[in-house]
C-alpha cells in the first residue's frame, strides 16, 4: 500500500495505491483511491507511467479526456466512472502487455487540493494448475499441468504424509513455449506415488504462486487449486 502524503508539502489530499500484477492477454486493474469530493466536475484523475511521454489516462469534468493519451495505451484504458465520486480512481487496463510493467502514478486534483501516489505494476502470466492421475504411465504417476506461465516458474512437489521430503529425484518438469512465443505451458510429472496421500504441485515465479492438490484413495480422487499474487503491497 502506498499512501501519497509526499514531502515539501507537495500533497494536500491523501492518495492510496496498491502494487499489483497483470496477467498478459487479460484485463488488469491498477488500484487507486483518494479522499472523495462532493462534485464530480471538480475531480481530475491522471494516470502517468514512467518512461512514457503522454498520459496513460485522464478523467476530468465527469468524462474521459484522452487528447494527451500516449499511443501505447490508446483504446485500452478506462476508469470506473460511477465510482469516481466515492474516491475510486482505479484504472482498468485491457489486454495487458508485458511492456505495461513499471511504475505508475495516480495523480488526483479535487476542490480540496492535489495529491499523488506511485504503484509498481508487474506483468507476466500465471494460471491454475490441474493435477491428475496419469493412467498411461507404468507406475502410479501424477501429472501437474498449468497452461500459461511467464517468467519461467519453479515447480516443487510436496506431500502431506512425507512432509519435508525432496521429490526432485522422482519428478520431471518441462516447459513448452506457447504459440504466442512468450508464455509457456508447465508440465510436471511425479512418479512412485502412494495411495491415501495428498500431494501438492506448487508453481511459483516472482509474480504468483499457485498450488494444485490431489488426494487419491481407493474409491475417489479429490482435487483443490489455489492461486495467490505475490506482490500486492499498498502504497
Amino acid at each position: 500500500l502506498i499512501i501519497g502524503f509526499g514531502i515539501s508539502g507537495r500533497h494536500s489530499i491523501t492518495v492510496t495505491t496498491v502494487a499489483s500484477a497483470g496477467n498478459i492477454g487479460e484485463d488488469g486493474i491498477l488500484s487507486c483511491t483518494f479522499e472523495p469530493d462532493i462534485k464530480l466536475s471538480d475531480i481530475v484523475i491522471q494516470w502517468l507511467k514512467e518512461g512514457v511521454l503522454g498520459l496513460v489516462h485522464e478523467f476530468k469534468e465527469g468524462k474521459d479526456e484522452l487528447s494527451e493519451q500516449d499511443e501505447m495505451f490508446r483504446g485500452r484504458t478506462a476508469v470506473f466512472a460511477d465510482q469516481v465520486i466515492v474516491g475510486n480512481a482505479s484504472l482498468r487496463l485491457k489486454n495487458v502487455q508485458l511492456t505495461d510493467a513499471g511504475t505508475y502514478k495516480c495523480y488526483i486534483i479535487t476542490s480540496k487540493g492535489k495529491g499523488n501516489a506511485n504503484l509498481e505494476y508487474k506483468t507476466g502470466a500465471f494460471s491454475m494448475p490441474e493435477v491428475n492421475v496419469d493412467y498411461n504411465a507404468s507406475s502410479e504417476t501424477l501429472r501437474c499441468e498449468a497452461p500459461r506461465w511467464f517468467p519461467q516458474p519453479t515447480v516443487v512437489w510436496a506431500s502431506q504424509v512425507d512432509q519435508g521430503a525432496n521429490f526432485s529425484e522422482v519428478s520431471n518438469t518441462s516447459f513448452e513455449l506457447n504459440s504466442e512465443n512468450v508464455t509457456m505451458k508447465v508440465v510436471s510429472v511425479l512418479y512412485n506415488v502412494t495411495i491415501n496421500n495428498t500431494y501438492s504441485c506448487m508453481i511459483e515465479n516472482d509474480i504468483a504462486k499457485a498450488t494444485g492438490d490431489i488426494k487419491v484413495t481407493e474409491s475417489e480422487i479429490k482435487r483443490r487449486s489455489h492461486l495467490q499474487l505475490l506482490n500486492s503491497k499498498a502504497s
Epitope: E50, G51, L53, Y107
Partner: antibody, heavy 123, light 112 residues
Framework: QAYLQQSGAELVRPGASVKMSCKAS????????MHWVKQTPRQGLEWIGA????????SYNQKFKGKATLTVDESSSTAYMQLSSLTSEDSAVYLC????????????????WGTGTTVTVSS | DVVMTQTPLSLPVSLGDQASISCRSS???????????LHWYLQKPGQSPKLLIY???NRFSGVPDRFSGSGSGTDFTLKISRVEAEDLGVYFC?????????FGGGTKLEIK
C-alpha cells in the same frame, strides 16, 4: 505533444535583473514539476532548481540561491525564472525542463526540454 | 555536490561502429529504496537535450534499441551498438539521486 516555449534572447547590463518565461502546452501544467538548467561552454549543464506547480513549492541549488527566483502562473501554464544582480558569469543559455516522473524522494528525469533563452550580460 | 565524470571527452567513430561512453560519480547513486537515478541525454547541435535512458538502463519511449545503458553504484556506461548519422551530438549523464542534481561534462560523438 508536450512542448515548452521559452522567451526570446536578452541583452542586459551588469547589475540589472532579467525575468524569462517557459510556457507549457500539450500537457497539464500542474501535474509535472518544472526545472531550470544553466548551460555554458565552460561549466556545461548546471541544475538551478525546481518548482512544483501543484503548490508553488521550490527547491534550489545552493549555488543559485539569491540569484534565481522561480515562480509559476497556473492560469497561463507558464513558469518564470528571475535572475538578479547580473554579472558576465550569468551569460548563458537557460533551459526549462519538465520532470516526467517523480516520487516522494526525488524527481526522476527530464523528458521535455524548453527551446532555451540566451542571456548576454554586457555593458 | 556529486561530481559526474564522463569519458572520453570526444569520441570519433565510423558509421555502423559501436560506441561506448563512461560516466563515474563521486559517490553512490543508489538511494535507500534501491533506485538508482542515473540518466542519459543527447544534445544535437543547435537543439535542446533529449532523454535517451532513465534509471541506468531503461530506454525512454521512442528511443531506438541500439541505445543501451548499464552499470551500478558509481560506474555507468552508455552503449550505441551501430552508430547512425542522427546519433551525432553531445551525450550527457545526469544524476537525480542527490540534490543538487548534477550533470557530466559531456562526450562529443563525431564522425572519424
Amino acid at each position: 505533444q508536450a512542448y515548452l516555449q521559452q522567451s526570446g534572447a536578452e541583452l542586459v547590463r551588469p547589475g540589472a535583473s532579467v525575468k524569462m518565461s517557459c510556457k507549457a502546452s500539450g500537457h497539464t501544467f500542474t501535474t509535472y514539476n518544472m526545472h531550470w538548467v544553466k548551460q555554458t561552454p565552460r561549466q556545461g549543464l548546471e541544475w538551478i532548481g525546481a518548482i512544483y506547480p501543484a503548490n508553488g513549492d521550490t527547491s534550489y541549488n545552493q549555488k543559485f540561491k539569491g540569484k534565481a527566483t522561480l515562480t509559476v502562473d497556473e492560469s497561463s501554464s507558464t513558469a518564470y525564472m528571475q535572475l538578479s544582480s547580473l554579472t558576465s558569469e550569468d551569460s548563458a543559455v537557460y533551459l526549462c525542463a519538465r520532470c516526467g516522473f517523480y516520487d516522494d524522494y526525488y524527481d526522476w528525469y527530464f523528458d521535455v526540454w524548453g527551446t532555451g533563452t540566451t542571456v548576454t550580460v554586457s555593458s | 555536490d556529486v561530481v559526474m565524470t564522463q569519458t572520453p571527452l570526444s569520441l570519433p567513430v565510423s558509421l555502423g561502429d559501436q560506441a561506448s561512453i563512461s560516466c563515474r560519480s563521486s559517490q553512490s547513486l543508489v538511494y535507500s529504496n534501491g533506485n538508482t537515478h542515473l540518466h542519459w541525454y543527447l544534445q544535437k547541435p543547435g537543439q535542446s537535450p533529449k532523454l535517451l535512458i532513465y534509471k541506468v538502463s531503461n530506454r525512454f519511449s521512442g528511443v531506438p534499441d541500439r541505445f543501451s545503458g548499464s552499470g551500478s553504484g558509481t560506474d555507468f556506461t552508455l552503449k550505441i551498438s551501430r552508430v547512425e548519422a542522427e546519433d551525432l551530438g553531445v551525450y550527457f549523464c545526469c544524476q537525480s539521486t542527490h540534490v543538487p542534481y548534477t550533470f557530466g561534462g559531456g562526450t562529443k560523438l563525431e564522425i572519424k
